[in-house]
């Protein structure tokens, strides 16, 4: 079996997680793609997905999660803005390919969000500021409900720093005039 690897991101509340998942261009360019969270003993939960068929570079936003699929370069960009401690957890990008099981894109993302003033740059941070001038619009994309049961058994144990995301959808509120410090992956 393929050994699943994780990439760890340690960020502070209010920052932006920005990761890139790459895929085989020719095979998956217009396939629907999704961002999932993996919780112990459960099937991965889809938090956001691209449209079907996926549109080139056009952002799809669900709450605080923004997906951008760059077809020509085989790249799915995932951003989670205004991070909260509760967002900590294990995430993955997948490609939906019905009737087959979703295809997982490596690596999985181990996100650890800690409390703290995000205006002070740390080891994984920078001082470039981002201004949200208007509340972003939300585009709801219809995501298939199925996920591979096999993925559950592959999930590594949670780290002690891990805090599960609540079952409620991740929502973005009160973003007007808030200063954020982005961390682009």
């Amino acid at each position: 079996a393929t050994k699943l690897t994780e990439e760890k991101y340690e960020l502070k509340e209010g920052q932006t997680l920005d990761v890139k998942c790459d895929y085989t261009l020719e095979k998956f360019a217009s396939s629907q793609k999704a961002w999932q969270i993996i919780r112990d003993g459960e099937m991965p939960k889809t938090l956001a997905c691209t449209e079907r068929p996926s549109k080139n570079s056009h952002p799809v936003q669900v709450g605080r999660i923004i997906l951008e699929d760059y077809h020509d370069h085989g790249l799915l960009r995932v951003r989670m803005v205004n991070l909260q401690v509760e967002d900590s957890g294990l995430y993955q990008c997948v490609i939906y390919q019905p009737p087959k099981e979703p295809h997982m894109l490596f690596d999985r993302i181990r996100l650890v969000v800690t409390k703290g003033f995000s205006g002070t740059p740390g080891s994984n941070e920078n001082s470039t500021q981002n201004v949200y001038k208007i509340p972003p619009t939300t585009t709801k994309a219809l995501c298939p409900l199925y996920t591979s049961p096999r993925t559950v058994t592959q999930a590594p144990p949670k780290s002690t720093a891990d805090v599960s995301t609540p079952d409620s959808e991740i929502n973005l509120t009160n973003v007007t005039d808030i200063i954020r410090v982005p961390v682009f992956n």
Epitope: T128, K133, V183
Partner: antibody
């Protein structure tokens, strides 16, 4: 065919202001992050600023923060860079570029900004 | 910010030569590195993205490799139109940063 055409460059005195424009065509402008990248005479490339598809997020390099403002008008397929309190070290060719996830895939021809007294 | 160091700063070569340019990142950037070619008075042109993927329309004599901190651009057989300055760009850490450039000159 993707095209980016910059305009608005010129000679300006230190402390002065200038507004650069970039006219985009050949692609769905409103679907892409856009950037300004500059190159001082005989020097290398430096990313200056970028802006999200809907204009709701802006990012700047530290050296221009508080002085430059990036904006866009999706109805006009146009990108702008308002440059205030200009300094001699801002002298450069300014390029408009399309962000494509992990690279700048298309660039304009550039417009020269000279800050000198 | 992530610093990108290119070497050499210039290289003299002849048509038909194999030319190798390296770029080193001050910290790991996975595979998120692009290479550009720039000729005098012209805008940069994207050659390679994601460390090794060839941009559409770019000749196959250009190739890229590497991941983490060390990356290489190779021109397998130099052509007259390849004499130019080459830049690397990292897109892993924000802000995106360029290398200082490598000028490929005629020997």
């Amino acid at each position: 065919e993707v095209q980016l055409v910059e305009s608005g460059g010129g000679l300006v005195q230190p402390g002065g202001s200038l507004r650069l424009s970039c006219a985009a065509s050949g692609f769905t402008f409103s679907s892409y992050w856009m950037s300004w990248v500059r190159q001082a005479p005989g020097k290398g490339l430096e990313w200056v600023a970028n802006i999200k598809q809907d204009g709701s997020e802006e990012y700047y390099v530290d050296s221009v923060k508080g002085r430059f403002t990036i904006s866009r008008d999706n109805a006009k397929n146009s990108l702008y860079l308002q440059m205030n309190s200009l300094r001699a070290e801002d002298t450069a060719v300014y390029y408009c570029a399309r962000d494509y996830g992990e690279s700048f895939d298309y660039w304009g021809q550039g417009t020269l900004v000279t800050v000198s007294s | 910010d992530i610093q990108m160091t290119q070497s050499p700063s210039s290289v003299s070569a002849s048509v038909g030569d194999r030319v190798t340019i390296t770029c080193r990142a001050s910290q790991g950037i996975r595979k998120w590195l692009a290479w550009y070619q720039q000729k005098p008075g012209r805008a940069p042109k994207l050659l390679i993205y994601a460390a090794s993927r060839l941009q559409s329309g770019v000749p196959s004599r250009f190739s890229g490799s590497g991941s983490g901190t060390d990356f290489t651009l190779t021109i397998s057989s130099l052509r007259p139109e390849d004499f130019a300055t080459y830049y690397c760009l990292q897109a892993h850490g924000f802000p995106w940063t360029f290398g200082q450039g490598t000028k490929v000159e005629i020997k």
